[in-house]
């Protein structure tokens, strides 16, 4: 049920919805407060509790740090006193909102303290090659829960220039396909940008020794990475997916890009990076199956296949919602999710997993759906539905609320109801209450109308009376009624003459140049406003500011000067506030002016 | 009630002119056009032309054309028909008559007729 | 201009007699016809238009059939007052023409 915005002066209490949480991953730098984010609505007031990683957290009661807790609020804000305080807090942590109408529940919140970023010391050797090798230089950056950047520069600041024969790799090696005597430098420097600490560290540079060679002998392709001939990939629906084939040889391989299994999507496909990287955008299902890169020069290829399996996050098919019930119904939430692998859906109630609940809970599970049947008041809870597989988790609160309400009829009492004999009319009596209230309409006598089989009632309440007659003129009493309570409301129905053309106007051939005349009486019932109209070919005809063309009155349209564009169909239109009727003539004009 | 009230008789000399008037009342003067009719004695009814009172538009018979003037003075709801050059066969009495509610160029209301002497 | 001729020119009858008066035009008028009646004196009366169709507040023993050039008036049952001469005009095409008249007169 849903209590219209007319049914007022019953106080009705909310179940607690989380209006605002933290996100699901949280990182936290050294120099950072941690602000735990959890509001939630309802009435009564909403009280908060904190889990981290299952257990009962107080942020209160922890010591060494100072806490803020917002008013009316689940959220918090931890300041530490020293820059390592954050490592302590790491942990998955779930807010609970309660009042005495259930518990709803915050998603997991990951919160991952990112230390101050340190590249381990260590001695860098010099790395000797001769000329027309290839090599790697290696960068290892240190692990971080954000996303960084890599670049290579020297000691001057310089980017290296990278093209076919020298790439930067997506893990942030430095590849040389083959080297030359000009790569000799004694100052490759990786540096590693961490955007969330807005600090920049580097590496210790790496001294590149190329020994000069007389006879630099060629090389078929061979690849730096993927170094196996293939590797099975999961990609996730919906995000990017990259692939990437770095080779060596001499001369410089070149790399292409193939798809055994079908065509490449060409509208969502980038190479970047010369070739050697390959960006598929948004991936789908569609793009499952084997990429396939080939490294070749002159002298021969070498070949990596990517076998790519598209899986999911959990998606919502049909995401549970709250409602209100009354006394006797069937509450049903439907928790339908999909995903690849199918995500596993558990449910709790009040945020307790119901294999926790005792066994003669009212509640079954069917086929990804809560139902509970003859719900009463003491059955109100919120439910969560939560699905999971190796790829995320979603979580969906929802409340069944059971409520007990008067029945109210929301029509306003003593309404009048105009309509014309042979019509419909229809009485209104919008009725509300939980249980539902049971409607009936009684005539003057108390009689119930529908003893005639021209009284017809909906569901809504409104009673129909069709084939409208003269004496169905009165008084109707409409007797709403649940369980609490029953109310009455009356209405009076007038039943008014219908409105008659008595003359309509009459078809006709008239000359171009000439005009012609068109009449329409009509009968109306004398207690109502009469108004004839007139439309042509389906619009409204006007007498048109200073144009001559038409003269309409009383009853009378004349069009003057007439040409072929005026011939068509011309209605006269009888109409009160209470009914419309219309009669059709048609004008056909001929040839040969008339005066 | 629909009234058309005609000016008195005249008597004229030939080739003099006269001016006949039709006061109308009890509708909308400019809703309907005005047509003027003349009948000599003994005789049958002849259409001279006719006048459309809200924008002064005319049709004329030709056997009249260049001796009739239809006008009409919408502040006090009347037309005018004046003949000129007149001739002893113009003896008749002339009338003024409303376009037909329910069709146009006949004729539901009529004047009372003015007699117009043409006599030397 | 279209040449209307009506018959009889004149015409005897007594009351409750039914009597028919024709009106000829020298080509297809498509319907646009009317009758007046005319007593001495006084400015005619519309009787019928279109042919067809009586003017209200008409007598319903007053009736117009007819088309293309040929049409009647019909009286079914003459009444004292309906003696007075008779008019069919045309209108389908400028000069509106009128018929010469037929005089219906008491036997």
């Known amino acids: 049920i849903q209590i219209p915005e007319e049914y007022e002066g019953h106080h009705v209490m909310e179940p607690p919805v989380i209006t605002e949480q933290s996100p699901r991953r949280l990182v936290v730098f050294p120099t950072d407060d941690i602000s735990l984010k959890c509001e939630a609505s309802g009435k009564p007031e909403v009280q908060f509790r904190w889990t981290r990683d299952g257990v009962h957290f107080k942020p209160k009661e922890e010591l060494g740090v100072t806490v803020y807790q917002s008013p009316h609020s689940g959220s918090f804000t931890i300041t530490g006193n020293n820059s390592n305080f954050a490592q302590r807090f790491q942990g998955i942590y779930r807010c609970f909102a309660s009042n005495k109408l259930g518990t709803a529940m915050s998603h997991e919140i990951r919160l991952m303290a990112e230390g101050a970023p340190k590249w381990p010391k260590e001695t860098v050797k010099p790395v000797e090659v001769e000329e027309g090798e290839s090599v790697v230089l290696p960068c290892n950056p240190p692990p971080s829960a954000e996303p960084l950047r890599i670049y290579w520069m020297n000691s001057k600041i310089l980017h290296i220039k990278q093209d076919e024969r020298v790439t930067m790799g997506q893990n942030g090696n430095l590849y040389f396909a083959n080297v030359l005597t000009s790569d000799n430098h004694s100052d490759y420097i990786c540096h590693a940008h961490f955007p969330g600490t807005r600090t920049i560290i580097q590496k210790e540079p790496i001294d590149l020794r190329v020994k000069a060679t007389n006879s630099m002998i060629d090389r078929k392709p061979r690849l730096l990475f993927p170094t196996n001939s293939s590797s099975h990939l999961v990609a996730l629906q919906g995000q990017p997916l990259v692939l990437e084939c770095i080779a060596e040889g001499f001369p410089t391989p070149t790399i292409k890009w193939l798809r055994p299994s079908g065509p490449m999507p060409a509208d969502r496909v980038t190479y970047q990076n010369h070739n050697k990287t390959l960006q598929l955008l948004k991936v789908g299902e569609e793009d499952d199956g084997e990429y396939r890169c080939l490294a070749e020069n002159s002298l021969g290829s070498a070949r990596h296949a990517y076998y790519v399996t598209v899986e999911a996050a959990p998606y919502w098919l049909h995401k549970p919602q709250s409602h209100l019930y009354g006394p006797g119904e069937t509450a049903r939430l439907d928790c339908q999710v999909q995903g690849r692998p199918q995500p596993e859906v558990t449910w709790r109630i009040n945020g307790i997993p119901v294999e926790e609940l005792a066994k003669d809970q009212k509640y079954r599970i069917q086929r990804g759906a809560l139902i509970l049947s003859n719900v009463q008041p003491s059955d109100t809870m919120v439910t969560q539905c939560e699905a999971r597989n190796r790829h995320g988790l979603l979580l969906a609160n929802a409340y069944i609320y059971v409520v007990q309400l008067p029945a109210k009829i929301l029509t306003a009492d003593n309404q009048t109801y105009m309509a014309v004999q042979g019509s419909t009319a229809y009485l209104l009596c919008k009725a509300f209450g939980a249980p539902v209230p049971s409607v009936q309409w009684l005539d003057e006598d108390g009689t119930t109308v529908l003893q005639d089989e021209r009284f017809f009632p909906y569901a809504n309440g409104t009673l129909g009376i069709r084939d409208l007659q003269a004496n169905d003129t009165g008084r109707y009493f409409c007797l709403a009624a649940n369980d609490q309570n029953n109310v009455t409301i009356m209405a009076n129905l007038k039943v008014k003459d219908a409105t008659q053309i008595t003359q309509g106007p009459r078809s006709t051939i008239e000359k171009k140049g000439s005009r012609v005349t068109f009449t329409c009486q009509a009968s109306f019932d004398p207690s109502l406003q009469p108004s004839i109209t007139w439309r042509g070919d389906g619009r409204d005809l006007q007498e048109l500011g200073d144009s001559d063309k038409y003269f309409i009155e009383d009853g009378r349209l004349v069009i003057h000067s007439l040409d072929y564009s005026d011939q068509g169909n011309y209605s006269c239109v009888a109409s009160t506030e209470l009914d419309v009727v219309e009669s059709r003539a048609q004008l056909l004009v001929v040839g040969s002016p008339g005066p | 009630q629909v009234q058309l009230v005609q000016s008195g008789a005249e008597v004229k000399k030939p080739g003099a002119s006269v001016k006949v008037s039709c006061k109308a009342s009890?509708?909308?003067?400019?809703?309907?056009?005005m047509h003027w009719v003349r009948q000599a004695p003994g005789q049958g009814l002849e259409w001279i032309g006719e006048?459309?009172?809200?924008?002064?538009?005319?049709n004329y018979n030709e056997r009249f054309q260049g001796r009739v003037t239809l006008t009409v003075d919408k502040s006090i709801s009347t037309a005018y028909m004046e003949l000129s050059r007149l001739r002893s066969d113009d003896t008749a009495v002339y009338y003024c008559?409303?376009?037909?509610?329910?069709?146009?160029?006949?004729?539901?209301?009529w004047g009372q007729g003015t007699l117009v002497t043409v006599s030397s | 201009d279209i040449q209307m001729t009506q018959s009889p020119s004149s015409l005897s009858a007594s009351v409750g007699d039914r009597v028919t008066i024709t009106c000829k035009a020298n080509?297809?008028?498509?319907?646009?016809l009317a009758w007046y009646q005319q007593k001495p004196g006084k400015a005619p009366k519309l009787l019928i238009s279109?042919?067809?169709n009586l003017v209200t507040g008409v007598p319903s023993r007053f009736s117009g059939s007819g088309s293309g050039k040929d049409y009647t008036l019909t009286i079914s049952s003459l009444q004292p007052e309906d003696f007075a001469t008779y008019y069919c005009?045309?209108?389908?095409?400028?000069?509106?023409?009128f018929g010469q008249g037929t005089k219906l007169e008491i036997k």
């Open positions: 008559a409303r376009d037909y509610y329910g069709t146009s160029y006949n004729f539901d209301y």
């Open positions: 279109g042919a067809t």
């Open positions: 005009q045309q209108y389908w095409s400028t000069p509106f023409t």
């Open positions: 009890g509708y909308t003067f400019t809703g309907y056009w």
């Open positions: 080509e297809d008028i498509n319907n646009r």
């Open positions: 006048i459309n009172p809200s924008n002064g538009r005319t």
